[in-house]
């Protein structure tokens, strides 16, 4: 994933007495928050694995890369990064693995340069629809976000709200059409059973989409037609049984696409014929010779590329009079 990485060589650790710095005062130019490491040369602040329960108030204005990973933040309130003067340079923010279960509306407001955001490995039971757009207007100001990393943000079963997790995430992605400039979206390992049909059409700038390690059974109602810039589509480790003609045609029509389909339980029956024909001709599927049948048992482990129409039969449906209860 594209979480911010640091080229910092010289970090200065804050002295403990800075912990009580008054947030109302503008931070000193070289000040570093308690429990953090700072490198002005690399424009990087790291507050990593420190069990912080809130975002430090006294972040230096120069910060471009901010790591707040491995903490205990729990809630990200509105304006969590709003400062005076604003953190105008902050471009990459990594909040992964910080026990966040709630991200409120406007949590990332007043970050005009924020291009990369990583919220992975947080059990987000409550992600506001306006977490990324900042307002509930039907059309919001465009977000500067280019990369949004949301891998493994699904909370445990017993902590989920009485609503679709997929729906909650998609609502946040689509609110106010703020993410029209998003180029990379990672949604791996979220137990998604389906992809709401309107989500991709409203993210026209996507170059990279990672939906790997979910539970997607079908792409029948998902349209890739508008994603003319899409370069990589990761669908490995899902529950896909077959790709149908409509999906195959749409993928083939994308000029730069590479599709990853490994580790899916392909069902090699009569419904697979179109996909097999397509696989033999297409160049868009990476490692296509590694796609093998999972079902029926007699076909298990066979390479899809080696199948022909005679191999792909469906058991005849018995007339009602012959069916057993």
């Amino acid at each position: 994933s594209s979480s911010p990485t640091s080229s910092a060589s010289s970090f200065s650790s804050s002295a403990p007495f800075l912990a009580s710095a008054v947030s109302a005062q503008p931070p000193l130019p070289d000040q570093c928050p308690a429990l953090c490491e700072c490198s002005e040369a690399a424009r990087t602040v790291k507050c990593v694995n420190r069990n912080l329960t809130e975002v430090p108030t006294d972040l230096p204005a120069y910060v471009r890369n901010l790591f707040l990973t491995g903490n205990q933040l729990a809630v990200l309130p509105a304006g969590a990064f709003a400062r005076r003067p604003p953190l105008a340079e902050l471009a990459a923010l990594n909040l992964s693995g910080s026990r966040l279960d709630e991200v409120r509306a406007g949590a990332f407001e007043h970050l005009p340069s924020l291009r990369q955001l990583d919220l992975s490995h947080n059990p987000l039971a409550d992600l506001s629809p306006f977490a990324f757009s900042g307002s509930n207007a039907s059309v919001s100001a465009p977000s500067p976000l280019v990369e949004l990393i949301l891998n493994h943000i699904v909370p445990p079963e017993d902590e989920r709200q009485n609503r679709s997790f997929e729906g909650m995430v998609v609502a946040a992605l689509l609110a106010g059409r703020a993410l029209q400039g998003l180029r990379r979206l990672e949604l791996a390992s979220n137990h998604f059973l389906y992809l709401p049909r309107d989500v991709l059409a409203q993210l026209p700038s996507l170059r990279h989409l990672d939906l790997s390690n979910n539970s997607l059974v079908s792409l029948t109602y998902v349209s890739f037609r508008n994603l003319t810039h899409l370069e990589s589509l990761h669908l490995e480790d899902n529950a896909l049984k077959v790709l149908h003609n409509g999906t195959l045609a749409e993928l083939q029509g994308l000029p730069h696409i590479r599709v990853f389909l490994d580790n899916n339980p392909w069902v090699c029956d009569c419904h697979m014929a179109d996909m097999v024909t397509w696989l033999k001709e297409t160049e868009v599927v990476q490692g296509k010779d590694r796609l093998t049948c999972a079902y029926p048992e007699k076909m298990r482990n066979r390479v899809l590329l080696e199948l022909n129409s005679a191999d792909l039969d469906c058991d005849p449906i018995l007339p009602p009079s012959l069916q057993t209860s």
Partner: antibody
Framework: QVQLQQFGAELVKPGAAVKMSCKAS????????ITWVKQRPGQGLDWIGD????????NYHEKFKSKATLTVDTSSSTAYMQLSSLTSEDSAVYYC?????????WGQGTTITVSS | DIQMTQTASSLSASLGDRVTISCRAS??????LNWYQQKPDGTVKLLIY???RLHSGVPSRFSGSGSGTDFSLTISNLEPEDIATYYC?????????FGGGTKLEIK
Amino acid sequence: QVQLQQFGAELVKPGAAVKMSCKASGYTFTSYWITWVKQRPGQGLDWIGDIYPGGGSTNYHEKFKSKATLTVDTSSSTAYMQLSSLTSEDSAVYYCARGLRDFDYWGQGTTITVSS
Amino acid sequence: DIQMTQTASSLSASLGDRVTISCRASQHINNYLNWYQQKPDGTVKLLIYSTSRLHSGVPSRFSGSGSGTDFSLTISNLEPEDIATYYCQQYSKLPRTFGGGTKLEIK
């Protein structure tokens, strides 16, 4: 029925190379990947790599990349593994097996002994 | 690489016993786990694939369960021909890796 036939044992000298075979029968050879596994005496199983007979694609475990070379001859439904620059560490039983993720049929193994 | 750990390198049981062999992965592997039996003569057979699915021809006294990182193979009614070494293997990532094996012996 599916069978993978491997041949007995070979004694080879240190520094030499050896090429072992795995003849498949009872199924369409090009339709299934072939995997190779190493087992040192009294030890567990170690995945070496796999090959797709229908197109020749291979994957190797990093630690065997400069040691093993996997090939196939589709006309005889036979997979081969060549081991180069042999040392005593290469003394082991080498199995071929059918499959890419689970290995549903195994050969009986070829024992390689490296000794001067 | 994903490490597969079989904590018991050997187990002793009586005929007719219910025996459980465990296997742990160093990271989450979904249900991408297989079990093999290696007889003393070196013969290797697939028993269980995808954590819990019985390979054709394998007796129904063998069963598999687990998910994520912790898995087990159970033999419900131990028979003399079950004396063997049992290996787990993950296929979540390359390289494929095996557990160290659990040798099953008769008391």
